[in-house]
Interface confidence: medium
């Protein structure tokens, strides 16, 4: 089963792909932003400042809610998918 925990983080101006990595590996921070201001992609808070927010899970941005959810891996829960269930 997949557990989805909702948190909200601000959209940022990075154009990396959505964060879907299995944590706790951490991505390196991106380079300078704002260089390609024409045709900028919609901001995704799963990138840049909050790219590592979901510890054991996948970051999903729900734009109309201005919300970020952490889709937790099995056995993990909590706001950042940081807690392991003892089942």
């Amino acid at each position: 089963s997949v557990r989805v925990e909702q948190v909200v983080k601000p959209p940022q101006n990075k154009t990396e792909s959505e964060n879907t990595s299995d944590k706790p590996k951490r991505k390196k921070k991106g380079g300078k932003n704002g260089k390609n201001r024409r045709n900028r992609k919609k901001k995704n808070p799963c990138n840049a400042e909050f790219q590592n927010f979901c510890i054991h899970g996948e970051c999903k941005y729900i734009e109309h809610l201005e919300a970020v959810t952490c889709k937790c891996q099995q056995e993990y829960f909590g706001e950042r998918c940081g807690e392991k269930s003892m089942k």
Partner: antibody, heavy 119, light 107 residues
Framework: EIQLQQSGPELVKPGASVKVSCKAS????????MYWVKQSHGKSLEWIGY????????GYSQKFKGKATLTVDKSSSTAYMHLNSLTSEDSAVYYC????????????WGQGTTLTVSS | DIKMTQSPSSMYASLGERVTITCKAS??????LSWFQQKPGKSPKTLIY???RLVDGVPSRFSGSGSGQDYSLTISSLEYEDMGIYYC?????????FGGGTKLEIK
């Protein structure tokens, strides 16, 4: 009750360094990024950077890279800002601020720490 | 860095008066703008986020508007407790940048 309690005023000599603390209470410290802001006397605010307390990952404004170092101690729910090679230009009030999650805005601020650099 | 130009830098207004403060960004900031109020010797307090969303507990006489590069904060009917310095902040792009502030005083 959520609080951000900053360390007291500092008077230091040029060339020295200082560490300002911001102790969080009343919430899950590692779930909210902490931000630092500088306010020089009678002037506007400047964004120094932020830190993700879970990983200890900081992000800095280019202007403050090499000047400020942001760290956290998860065990005491405390964020720190270390400022080095101090000059009179660093004299200011420094604030820590938490960013809320839903909705996301700067919802809690520390009371500010006054730093005076003078010989 | 995105430059935020705030105006006026200071102003006097009478109680009950409608007050408007403006902030212009050097580029489109996609409504990622907050307004803060700061009283002497105190920490800033967020009034508005995402250009027009009122923070819980902030009086409804405060409102924000704007898009693209141009934004404004309006106080519909000035009260004595509203005096202080007001700042805008863009959080569209790193580094976040503040406007220079508007000092609001009572006539």
């Amino acid at each position: 009750e959520i609080q951000l309690q900053q360390s007291g005023p500092e008077l230091v000599k040029p060339g020295a360094s200082v560490k300002v603390s911001c102790k969080a209470s009343g919430y899950a410290f590692t779930n909210y990024n902490m931000y630092w802001v500088k306010q020089s006397h009678g002037k506007s605010l400047e964004w120094i950077g932020y830190i993700d307390p879970y990983y200890g990952d900081p992000g800095y404004s280019q202007k403050f890279k090499g000047k400020a170092t942001l760290t956290v101690d998860k065990s005491s729910s405390t964020a720190y800002m270390h400022l080095n090679s101090l000059t009179s230009e660093d004299s200011a009030v420094y604030y820590c601020a938490r960013r809320g999650n839903f909705p996301y805005y700067f919802d809690y601020w520390g009371q500010g720490t006054t730093l005076t650099v003078s010989s | 860095d995105i430059k935020m130009t705030q105006s006026p830098s200071s102003m006097y207004a009478s109680l009950g008066e409608r007050v408007t403060i403006t902030c212009k960004a050097s580029q489109d900031i996609n409504s990622y703008l907050s307004w803060f109020q700061q009283k002497p010797g105190k920490s800033p307090k967020t009034l508005i986020y995402r250009a027009n969303r009122l923070v819980d507990g902030v009086p409804s006489r405060f409102s924000g508007s704007g898009s693209g590069q141009d934004y404004s904060l309006t106080i519909s009917s000035l009260e004595y407790e509203d005096m202080g310095i007001y700042y805008c902040l863009q959080y569209d792009e790193f580094p976040y940048t503040f406007g220079g502030g508007t000092k609001l005083e009572i006539k």
